[in-house]
Each structure stands twice: as C-alpha cells, then as structure tokens.
C-alpha cells in the first residue's frame, strides 16, 4: 500500500472521522431548514461540500474507485454520497437555467445520516429487504383489490349519483333544463335535498332497503358523485381507489354509509368481507413480512 492509501485507511477507520461527518450532516440539515438564509451561509455551503468531497476522496483512496470487489462504487451507500457531491458541484458551477429543481437534491444530504448511524443503516436495510420480500404479498394484495373492485363495479356502478330531487318544479321546468342551468352550490340546494351541514345532496336508492327521500322529493340519478366526484364505483380505477380506501380504513365508514344508502343494506356483506380480508388479513400479512425481514436483518 502506498503511504497515501495507508493514511486514508487510518482516517477512514477513525471514530473521530465518523463523528466529523455526522456533525457536518446534522449542521447541514439545520442550515437547510432556514427560510431566508443570510449571505454568509453560502460560504458554509461550500465548506459542507468540501467536507463531503474530502470524505469521498478518503474513501476512494482507501478502498479504490470501482474496479475491485470492496471499492467505493460497489457499496450502494456510497452511490448516495457520490450523487450528493455531483449535484453540489452541478448546482454551483454549471448554469442550467432553472436550478430550483436541482436544488431539491440537496435534501439527499440528510439521507447521508443513514450511512453514518449503524442502527439506522440496519433499519433501512431491513426496509429494503422487506420491499423485496413484499413483492409476492403486493401481487396478492393488488389481485384481491382488483377482484373486489370488479365486484364493486358491478354492484354499485352509478349508484352514488342517486340524489333526492325536488318534485314540485315550476310548470315549464324539467330535470334536464334545470341541470343545464345549475351553476352554483346554492342553485343545487334549491333543487336537491341536503342534510344540514352536508356538502353533498342526500343519497337515495331504488331498492326497498336503500335510503328513501323525504316528502316532496324523489330519487333520481343525475349529476356528479359525492366528495367532488372522487367517491364512486363508476370505473375500475375509481372502484380500485374505493377498495384501497377500505383496506387502509381511510374514513371508510363514510364510504360504507354512502354506498349502503344508495344500494341497500344487504350490501353490508360486501363491506364485511372486504374489511376482514383486506383490512385485517392483508394489512397484517404485510406487517408480518416487514417484521420477518427486520428480524433477518438483525441476525
């Protein structure tokens, strides 16, 4: 080994070197949080870039660049360091017009903390491993969601457009003429029944066990879906989103109530099955795989 390489190895394995890098990263993160940084922070930026460059040079001199098995670029964690440095110089010395997008990559510096803190490295390693192991579970999850989305599509397509419409129209008004002239929320409230505090017209259905309209209103299928049109089973993609919402239990009781009011109480069976399979079983299966991967990584 050449003297330069021996010195580089000594620096690299020294605990103070790790401490210096860690302190630099943390200080850098603090500086990045500044809203309107003063002018002198520019010089601090250069210092940080200098330290990161020095760290990478030490690593390259100690381990080699990319030819051998344990060289600098053979370690994925070093790819991050390399990218951080490349972007630091790119944003500083190369005029690329709108650099604000490139400046975003400065945030990657915070990720350098992972490679320095051993515990964090283990957790992230486990996370990456779990993602690899999750592929089968993910395929199963997407398959199950797709199947139920298709069932939902068949059962509830268009149902969430059912609304309670005012029966006593002016003598020359028709449903179509009204829908063509409605513009504001207030116009809608004149013709459709709204519960107090609700932003959507009252849903209703045509089966005996579905929601009924109050006196003076009749159930029609018209207009858009609830929640600004985002809640529906009208296409496979919307149905899939609704099923994902059920699986993650994201305000799912509202979707459940809306659908049951529009389709009928019998369809609670569909929701029971989806919640049990999707929310209880699949979510826990995903967690189990993550836990297993973490255990493996620890060992």
């Amino acid at each position: 080994f050449s003297p330069l390489r021996r010195i580089s190895i000594k620096i690299l394995v020294h605990s103070l070197f790790s401490m210096l890098i860690m302190c630099t990263i943390l200080t850098n993160c603090i500086f990045m949080t500044m809203n309107n940084p003063p002018d002198w922070t520019k010089n601090v930026e250069y210092t940080f870039t200098g330290i990161y460059t020095f760290e990478s040079l030490v690593k390259i001199l100690a381990r080699g660049f990319c030819v051998g098995e344990f060289t600098f670029l053979r370690d994925p964690w070093n790819w991050l360091d390399f990218v951080v440095i490349v972007f630091a110089y790119l944003t500083e010395f190369v005029n690329l017009g709108n650099v604000s997008a490139l400046r975003t990559f400065r945030v990657l510096r915070a990720l350098k903390t992972i490679s320095v803190i051993p515990g964090l490295k283990t957790i992230v390693g486990a996370l990456i491993q779990s993602v690899k192991k999750l592929s089968d579970v993910m395929i199963l999850t997407v398959f199950c969601l797709s199947v139920f989305a298709l069932i939902g599509l068949q059962l509830f397509m268009g149902n969430l457009k059912h609304k309670c419409f005012r029966n006593s129209l002016e003598n020359n008004e028709t449903l179509e003429s009204i829908m063509n002239t409605l513009e504001s929320e207030e116009d809608f409230r004149k013709y459709f029944y709204y519960l107090e505090g609700s932003k959507d017209a009252l849903l209703c259905g045509f089966s005996t066990d579905s929601g009924q309209c109050p006196e003076g209103y009749t159930c029609v299928k018209i207009g858009r879906n609830p929640d600004y049109g985002y809640t529906s089973f009208d296409t496979f993609s919307w149905a899939f989103l609704a099923l994902f919402r059920l699986m993650t239990q994201d305000y799912w009781e509202n979707l459940y109530q809306q659908t049951l009011r529009a389709a009928g109480k019998t369809y609670m069976i569909f929701f029971v099955v989806v919640i049990f399979l999707g929310s209880f079983y699949l979510i826990n299966l995903i967690l189990a795989v993550v836990a297993m991967a973490y255990e493996e990584q620890n060992q």
Epitope: N167, S168, L175, E176, F206, E215, T218, C219, V220, K221
Partner: nanobody
Framework: EVQLVESGGGLVQAGGSLRLSCAAS????????MRWHRQGAGKQREFVAR???????GYADSVKGRFTISRDNAKNTVYLQMNNLNPEDTAVYYC??????????????????WGRGTLVTVSS
C-alpha cells in the same frame, strides 16, 4: 326503453266530461312527478296539472276546480279527470313524467319523458 302512452281523448260536447290516462311502460324504478300539458292549434304548449310521487297536486289557473289529476303508482299511470269542458280546452294533451328506469346494460337513467299526445275536441 321508457314509453308514455296517452289515451281517453276524443270529441265531447261543451259542459261534458272526459278522463285522460297516461301509462308509463318500461323497466321503471321510480316515477317522480307526472304532468299534463296541452297545445292548442297555433298556440304554445301550456301546463295543465301535475302530481308528485307523494300525491301532491298543482293546477293551472284556467283549469282549477274543473280538472282533477290522480295517479296509480302500482300501474305507473296518471289520470286527468276533465269536467265542465269548454271549447277553449280543445287541444292535444301531452303527458310528461320524470322517470328513473333501468336501461340497456342494466344501468340506471333518470330523465324527462313525453307521450305523443291525445287530441281532445270540445264542440259548442
């Protein structure tokens, strides 16, 4: 497809009575309001009477007290009982309904449907 068919029109003496009926057919789920309109020769179509699915009624001023609208929800039919007819009542009477029905492919559609009309002639 939803169809509205009017019947009961014809020739009647002034002061006489007629009963018009309008039957809706098709895969109907719900009928909201049902209305009668009329159009005399060279005149614009005018509203006559209406009835909602909870049997609330409304009439044009010109027919109030003479005409009575009713409906049979089980048969999806609306009736217009016309008493004390006069020559000004001569017109083609049209039935209109707000219908929600199951259409091709099993999807549901709500819309306004019209009948083809039935002619009522009142002679003096």
């Amino acid at each position: 497809e939803v169809q509205l068919v009017e019947s009961g029109g014809g020739l009647v003496q002034a002061g006489g009575s007629l009963r018009l009926s309008c039957a809706a057919s098709g895969r109907i789920l719900r009928i909201g309001y049902m209305r009668w309109h009329r159009q005399g020769a060279g005149k614009q179509r005018e509203f006559v009477a209406r009835i909602t699915d909870d049997s609330a009624t409304g009439y044009a001023d010109s027919v109030k007290g003479r005409f009575t609208i009713s409906r049979d929800n089980a048969k999806n039919t609306v009736y217009l009982q016309m008493n004390n007819l006069n020559p000004e009542d001569t017109a083609v009477y049209y039935c209109e309904a707000l219908v929600t029905a199951s259409v091709r492919g099993g999807s549901i559609h709500s819309g306004t449907y019209w009948g083809r009309g039935t002619l009522v002639t009142v002679s003096s």
